[in-house]
Amino acid sequence: SGPVKELVGSVGGAVTFPLKSKVKQVDSIVWTFNTTPLVTIQPEGGTIIVTQNRNRERVDFPDGGYSLKLSKLKKNDSGIYYVGIYSSSLQQPSTQEYVLHVYEHLSKPKVTMGLQSNKNGTCVTNLTCCMEHGEEDVIYTWKALGQAANESHNGSILPISWRWGESDMTFICVARNPVSRNFSSPILARKLCEGAADDPDSSMV
């Protein structure tokens, strides 16, 4: 039994659970997902039993080996996978555990503007970046671009303080997860602050 292997997949993609076995005489190999049997292989008779019909087209064993390839990944395929190799030559089965994380490809992040104040010619507000569908494990970075600056800010909330008369700035939110990255539409400080002067309430940008 080796250490737990962490695997990452993307929705619609495929992942292979690598299995290297030194066992000579294998009687059966059982793959399970969150304690539910997924596939049983009996090498002697060349039998592969896929427990659930819906997984039949998604399960494959590439190159004639016992490594499990799972295709057409869905979010709820995330979880713990476990393989047991059973053999009369072994006192107890050889096992390996895997943890699969399936992530969605990120759409464009949305930006909302918080309450705003315009005092002494300075426009002060927060921009908040988020994913519309609440995707998990998303890391947000803000890029602030302008003649006077090219800065990055980590986190979903960007505090803004911009003086009227300063050179315009552009703000872009970048969202990343382990399988994809995307960016928001650019937001111009001048437009943001003009709009806020008219409407003091929080709004979508």
Partner: antibody, heavy 118, light 107 residues
Framework: EVQLVESGGGLVQPGGSLRLSCAAS????????MSWVRQAPGKGLEWIGE???????INYAPSLKDKFIISRDNAKSLYLQMNSLRAEDTAVYYC????????????WGQGTLVTVSS | DIQMTQSPSSLSASVGDRVTITCKAS??????VAWYQQKPGKVPKLLIY???TRHTGVPDRFSGSGSGTDFTLTISSLQPEDVATYYC?????????FGQGTKVEIK
């Protein structure tokens, strides 16, 4: 010093295959998306595709998807497997790293020339 | 795919001249545009990203502007070392695409 070094180019016959490698040094390769870009002699740049840090996502230019396979390992190498090569695949092949993991490339390898000819 | 059309395809100008290269996208790409310089026999070098932000170490005679579908790279005062081919790239959507290049020479 941040560096990318391609290898594996050379002369190959039409219909043949070739595997290019790109060795990275001077940065944490395991954190970066990586791309392949090619340039036919006297022509412009063409993006081939990219791979994310753990190889779970690979995006290709649709016109090249069926003949090229991008892969990587954690020993700081990026690969491009090229199959069914034709004369029009003759080009300098570059591996490129995006600046700060964004979408524009600040580090390029020196390129490796692939010539497809009988 | 988004097409990036550069013009002119080549130009010749005198040292000190202001040089302008344009890039037109076949659809809106916001400001997701980068510019590269490729000197003869060399590898491409990043000049500008997010349409107008200069990359570290790029001389301030290089500037970028534009949004949507129309983008411009300007060299305010052409220098002999600027002889190169310049490429625009869009990264708004897959596949990333480059312009066909603009070759800049000295008169």
């Amino acid at each position: 010093e941040v560096q990318l070094v391609e290898s594996g180019g050379g002369l190959v016959q039409p219909g043949g295959s070739l595997r290019l490698s790109c060795a990275a040094s001077g940065f944490d390769f395991s954190r970066y998306w990586m791309s392949w870009v090619r340039q036919a002699p006297g022509k412009g740049l063409e993006w081939i595709g990219e791979i994310n840090p753990d190889s779970s996502t690979i995006n290709y230019a649709p016109s090249l998807k069926d003949k090229f396979i991008i892969s990587r390992d954690n020993a700081k190498s990026l690969y491009l497997q090229m199959n069914s090569l034709r004369a029009e695949d003759t080009a300098v092949y570059y591996c490129a790293r995006p600046d700060g993991n964004y979408w524009y490339f600040d580090v390029w390898g020196q390129g490796t020339l692939v010539t497809v000819s009988s | 795919d988004i097409q990036m059309t550069q013009s002119p395809s080549s130009l010749s100008a005198s040292v000190g001249d202001r040089v302008t290269i344009t890039c037109k996208a076949s659809q809106d790409v916001g400001i997701a545009v980068a510019w590269y310089q490729q000197k003869p026999g060399k590898v491409p070098k990043l000049l500008i990203y997010w349409a107008s932000t200069r990359h570290t170490g790029v001389p301030d005679r290089f500037s970028g502007s534009g949004s949507g579908t129309d983008f411009t790279l300007t060299i305010s005062s052409l220098q002999p070392e600027d002889v190169a081919t310049y490429y625009c790239q869009q990264y708004s959507s897959y596949p990333y695409t480059f312009g066909q290049g603009t070759k800049v020479e000295i008169k």
